[in-house]
Interface confidence: low
């Protein structure tokens, strides 16, 4: 069964900056990745970035840089300052659309007691929805 993992960490060098990393553990080819915060995409969450293998990457504030890390994982850096900046308990969600598995989404947030620059290893987060 495919799984999605989500890792959130606060950067030690810029304490109000977050890095979100997400990956897809499946055999299908990924056609789209959507990163949102405040809840799952389409369920009250706000889209931060959309990564398409062929059409490129689109991102919206406070997303600072989205990129493909590997063929099945992405990372996103969030701007740390301003009214729309994330707080420690913000939920981030990643949705992977793949063929033939369909859409798989998981969410994660900063570990409650994490020190800046530290985070748990990227383990599969609970799968919220498989379309």
């Amino acid at each position: 069964t495919p799984e999605v993992w989500v890792q959130v960490r606060m950067e030690a060098t810029e304490l109000s900056s977050f890095t979100i990393r997400c990956g897809f553990l499946g055999s299908g080819s990924i056609s789209l990745v959507t990163v949102s915060w405040g809840g799952p995409n389409g369920a009250g969450g706000t889209t931060l970035a959309v990564l398409h293998p062929e059409r490129g990457i689109r991102q919206w504030a406070p997303a600072r840089q989205a990129r493909w890390e590997t063929q099945s994982s992405i990372s996103l850096i969030l701007e740390g300052s301003g009214a729309s900046s994330p707080c420690a308990n913000t939920t981030f969600c990643c949705k992977f659309a793949s063929f033939p598995e369909g859409s798989w989404e998981a969410c994660g947030s900063l570990p409650p007691s994490s020190d800046p620059g530290l985070s748990a290893p990227p383990t599969p987060a609970p799968i919220l929805r498989a379309d």
């Epitope: 950067e11 062929e54 490129g56 840089q65 990129r67 493909w68 590997t70 063929q71």
Partner: antibody, heavy 120, light 107 residues
Framework: EVQLQQSGPELVKPGASVKISCKAS????????INWVKQSHGKSLEWIGY????????GYNQKFKSKATLSADNPSSTAYMELRSLTSEDSAVYYC?????????????WGQGTPVTVSS | DIQMTQSPASLSVSVGETVTIICRVS??????LAWYQQKQGKSPQLLVY???NLAEGVPSRFSGSGSGTQYSLKINSLQSEDFGSYYC?????????FGGGTKLEIK
């Protein structure tokens, strides 16, 4: 005008370390990745890694993970690459290059290159 | 890692001719590919990004095409300033890798 100015040629002894600099001008330094690329004499190009100056985040080619350390000093808009435990295999020209996020990560501006010669 | 195989390795051509350089990739990179030109003793220069888009200031005699695992760079009506080496590079996840290069020489 965007420019990447690299430090001058280096002649170093085997086993030593060297730190190459790449000073950026003409754009907001923290907005773009700086990549480092190796070119041995008469050979192709090898990607070493990138640094994202805004948070100091970096990504490496595993082949160079134990050889190179990338860093950046934002106030001076300068990226650095330190190469350690040098051998003759490390003799090459090293380039820094800006990664253009609007051009699907292609490297749109390059430094002039820093030749490194490892010799006893 | 993704492997990039460029062909031919070298090419001897005359001014005014048309040349095509091929870059074969070990897996689908979804057009996440760039082409660079490098002249002797100089830094590489970006020619094409996203497989088909010409970089700023690049003459229209250059064109990029391809998708999936095969890409090509075409140079129409070759000029004397076009001689040098050409490299493809993918950006579909790290490590970004370059092709082995194609050396374009004057016949």
């Amino acid at each position: 005008e965007v420019q990447l100015q690299q430090s001058g040629p280096e002649l170093v002894k085997p086993g030593a370390s060297v730190k190459i600099s790449c000073k950026a001008s003409g754009y907001t330094f923290t907005d773009y990745n700086i990549n480092w690329v190796k070119q041995s004499h008469g050979k192709s190009l090898e990607w070493i890694g990138y640094i994202y100056p805004y948070i100091g985040g970096s990504g490496y080619n595993q082949k160079f993970k134990s050889k190179a350390t990338l860093s950046a000093d934002n106030p001076s808009s300068t990226a650095y690459m330190e190469l350690r435990s040098l051998t003759s295999e490390d003799s090459a020209v090293y380039y820094c290059a800006r990664e253009d996020k609007t051009a699907r990560n292609a490297m749109d501006y390059w430094g002039q290159g820093t030749p490194v010669t490892v010799s006893s | 890692d993704i492997q990039m195989t460029q062909s031919p390795a070298s090419l001897s051509v005359s001014v005014g001719e048309t040349v095509t350089i091929i870059c074969r990739v070990s897996e689908n990179i979804y057009s996440n590919l760039a082409w660079y030109q490098q002249k002797q003793g100089k830094s590489p220069q970006l020619l094409v990004y996203e497989a088909t888009n010409l970089a700023e200031g690049v003459p229209s005699r250059f064109s990029g095409s391809g998708s999936g695992t095969q890409y090509s760079l075409k140079i129409n009506s070759l000029q004397s300033e076009d001689f040098g080496s050409y490299y493809c590079q993918h950006f579909w996840g790290t490590p970004y890798t370059f092709g082995g290069g194609t050396k374009l020489e004057i016949k």
